[in-house]
Each structure stands twice: as C-alpha cells, then as structure tokens.
Interface confidence: medium
C-alpha cells in the first residue's frame, strides 16, 4: 500500500474530495475532508502532492470516509487528493485520484485591489463601476464608503472579482472594500486601499471629453457650411448665359 | 464548544418593543453569524435574520423586515434581537442558533418566551 | 423564497419499524444547503442531517439523509424509544426557511 500504482481512468473513476467547515478557515478550526468513492470502497487514502506514501489512511466498508484534520494550522494548508481500493484490486493499486482540494489556513485573505471602470473621474449623470478584485473564487464582496457605518453594497461572486454600479449623482465620495468567505466560520481580507471618486471638473482651462467632442462637431459644422457656400459661389460663376437660378 | 446563553421570559404590551440577548462563550464569537428563530406555541419554526458580528453585516427576512433589529456586542460576546410594534402573534419562544457547520444550525441557545398581552 | 413541504404530517410507527420522511422543496435547493432537525416538547431543535446527507457530530448511523434538487429524504434505519419527535427540513441559502414538519408518534 505504500506505493500507489494508478491504473488508467475508465478502471477505478475517481472519487469526490470535500471539505467542511470550509476550504478557507482560520487557524485551530477543526476541518474534516470528506473522500466519496463512487462505490463501496475497502480503504481509503489521503494524499498531498508529491508524496507516494498516503497522508492518512481510512479502512471503511463503505462509499465515504472522512479524515479528521484538529486544530489546523497555516502549514496543513495545501493541496489535497483522494483515492480508495478494494480488497479485490492488486497490491498497491489505487484509483484515479480525485481533484485537487485547496486549503487554505490564514487569519486573514490577502487585501483585495479596488479599482474604477472606466475610471476614477465621473461626469454628471454618469454612471462608475467599482471593481473589487481578490484572488479566490467564490467569496462574497462588501463595499463601504468612508463616513457610512454599514456596507454600501455586498455581492457574493463566483469570480476573483465582483463589481459594483454607483449611479454617476451619488458616485463622489472615498471607497473601499473587502471580501470574505461566504459561510462561517468567516475569515477576512484586509480592507482594499481607498478609492476616491471625483466629479469631472468642468471649469478648469483644459477641455474635458464632452467639450472637445462638441467642440469638433461645431467644427464639423462650419467646414460643411463654408463647403456649401464655396460650392454654391462656383457653380453660379460657371452657369451659361440667360441660366440662372 | 460553543454555548449560547439567553435572557429570561418576557411579558409584552401589544404596540411596545422587546430585546432578547443571547450570551455566547467557548468559541469564537465573531467569526460566526448568530441567526434567530422563532417557534409560535404548538407552530413550526421560522427564521427572522441573522448577523455576522465581525462583519456588521445582517440579513433579515422579508416577513419581518422594518420589525426586526438584530445587533452584536463583540466585546461581550452577546447578539440582540429587537422587535417592535408588537402583535400578539409574535407570541413565540425566541431562539438564537450559531451555524458551526456551513450555515446548519449545529447550536442553540434554550429560547426565550416572549408574552404578547394586553 | 423557497417553500418546503414536508410529508406525511404525522407517522405513527412502532419502536425498531423503518422511518421515511419527505421534503419537497418549491424550487431546486444545493444539496449543501439541506438538512434536517429534530425537536421534542419543550427542548430546543438538534441539528441531524446537514448537507442532504451528511450527519452531524454525535447523530448515530441510524439517521441518514439523501436527495436532490427539489426531493430530498430523512430515514430512520430503526426507530428507537427516544426518535419519537418532530422532524423538520431546512433550506439554509441566503434565507433560511423551515418545512412545517413531520410527527413521529408511537403507533
């Protein structure tokens, strides 16, 4: 049993490997990693990485077996198979491994980026979307602004990110956020560095995007004018005699 | 392991207010969401709300939306359930439930008798 | 909100027959955000089943759960004198809502 051999896919499927409370929890929780075989097994085994000698062993008759990890600390953290046997399979003969289960042991989740799309300078009546973006899928995203006590907005997303839509009227202000994983026990990012949203200031000397925009349709204007008037002078200069308009 | 801890037995006017406190000790408070829920006499149970203290964060049904206030004090350890305009429906034991195990809840405070009469 | 309809309302079955209790849900639940309690008089609820099928600390091996998306099952391999109870099922996604629940009597 010390050196697994594993045969191809279609012979052992692979099992299904879980993790409850949670795949990120805080130090001294209690996790147990639950191996589902997709039929009976005899043992079951735990495997890290690299490592031919299973982590743990489980000899159970039946389709789950779950190993106990106590009081986890950050360097339990890692990734994690699976792989069960019968009685009936050769010596050393496991099945395909299950995926890989990432844990993660930490006080706290690395500090998200904060970020605003298209950017951080808003124009009246327009609309800014704030972007938080972490580095673990399935987390849940809580935006504040600075001088409200509750949270401004909260999202759970499948994504290393979630966005928040602030309409452009009350989008001025200072922001931040974090994320957290979605069910207890909770485990924290640090908050974001803050993100000052400002309005487009419309009376400096430099012109903004909606004034060089009108600036060039007036100029748009004026050459199709000047075009017209041109071409109106030139085509009554030619007419023949006893034509005109 | 954790253990919640409840205030005593109410009697209520009908119109006034109650604050139930749940107590808890053996674990780490914060990083949990203390829910509430409540079981009318001889009646099923229903869930109000919750909060993530170290959050700040609560989640209210929609039934008891605008009613219902639930409150956390990280220093003691101790979440709060207000809830005003009484009617005597509200007439229930009052629980307070902490979800160790995804978001079953794995424990429970003894529950809280709330009397709504006039 | 998802509604949960548990049946039968009331079992009556004798000590060591099989119990089975049902709970429909009104649209698909994650199984991981399924289970079930049991309450007797006076006594807070105890948490059996938690993710459809997963049992609780110290729940004995005669309680088992199962199901899917909108079915899911509580089993009681060998009632004893002390699962004489009422049952609930819970959903416990972003708002947690309760069956209305089963009685287990002694026939």
């Known amino acids: 049993d010390i050196t697994p051999s594993v045969p191809p896919a279609s012979y052992h499927p692979k099992p299904w490997l879980g993790a409850q409370p949670a795949t990120v929890v805080t130090p001294g929780v209690n996790v147990t990693l639950r191996c589902r075989a997709p039929q009976p097994a005899w043992r079951f085994g735990l495997f890290k990485p690299g490592e031919i000698a299973p982590l743990l062993f489980r000899d159970v008759s039946s389709e789950l077996a779950e190993f106990f990890l106590e009081e986890v600390t950050p360097a339990q953290g890692g990734s994690y198979r699976c792989c069960y046997r019968r009685p009936d399979w050769g010596p050393g003969v496991w099945s395909q491994p299950s995926d890989v289960l990432e844990l993660l042991v930490t006080e706290e989740l690395p500090r998200p980026s904060l970020v605003a799309l298209p950017g951080p300078v808003v124009g009246p009546g327009a609309n800014v979307s704030l972007r938080c973006a972490g580095r673990l899928r399935n987390m849940s995203f809580v935006l504040y602004r600075e001088g409200v006590a509750a949270p401004l907005q909260y999202r759970h997303s499948a994504q290393p990110w979630a966005d928040f839509t602030l309409l452009g009227a009350r989008a001025p202000g200072t922001y931040s956020c974090y994320y957290h994983t979605p069910s207890a026990p909770y485990v924290l990012s640090q908050r974001s560095e803050v993100l000052v949203i400002s309005w487009e200031d419309s009376g400096s000397s430099d012109y903004t995007r909606g004034n060089l925009v009108r600036l060039g349709l007036a100029g748009l204007v004026l050459i199709s004018l000047g075009a017209l008037v041109t071409f109106d002078w030139r085509s009554q200069n030619r007419a023949p005699a006893g034509i005109r308009p | 392991q954790v253990q919640l801890v409840q205030s005593g037995a109410e009697v209520k006017k009908p119109g006034s207010s109650v604050k139930v406190s749940c107590k808890a000790s053996?674990?780490?408070?914060?990083?949990?969401?203390i829910s509430w829920v409540r079981q009318a006499p001889g009646q099923g149970l229903e869930w109000m709300g919750k909060?993530?203290?170290?959050?700040?964060?609560?989640n209210y049904a929609q039934k008891f939306q605008g009613r219902v206030t639930i409150t956390a004090d990280k220093s003691t350890s101790t979440a709060y359930m207000e809830l005003s305009s009484l009617r005597s429906e509200d007439t229930a034991v009052y629980y307070c439930?902490?979800?160790?195990?995804?978001?079953?809840?794995?424990?429970w405070g003894q529950g809280t008798m709330v009397t709504v009469s006039s | 909100e998802i509604v949960l309809t548990q049946s039968p309302g009331t079992l009556s079955l004798s000590p060591g027959e099989r119990a089975t209790l049902s709970c429909r849900a009104s649209?698909?639940?994650?199984?991981?955000?399924l289970a079930w309690y049991q309450q007797k008089p006076g006594q807070a609820p105890r948490l059996l089943i938690y993710g459809a099928s997963s049992r609780a600390t110290g729940i004995p091996d005669r309680f088992s759960g199962s199901g899917s998306g909108t079915d899911f099952t509580l089993t009681i391999s060998r009632l004893e004198p002390e699962d004489f109870a009422v049952y609930y099922c819970?959903?416990?996604?972003?708002?947690?809502?309760f069956g209305p629940g089963t009685k287990v009597d002694i026939k």
């Open positions: 439930a902490n979800p160790l195990t995804f978001d079953a809840f794995d424990i």
């Open positions: 053996g674990g780490t408070f914060s990083s949990y969401a």
């Open positions: 649209q698909s639940v994650s199984s991981s955000y």
């Open positions: 819970q959903q416990y996604g972003s708002s947690p809502t």
């Open positions: 909060i993530i203290p170290i959050l700040g964060i609560t």
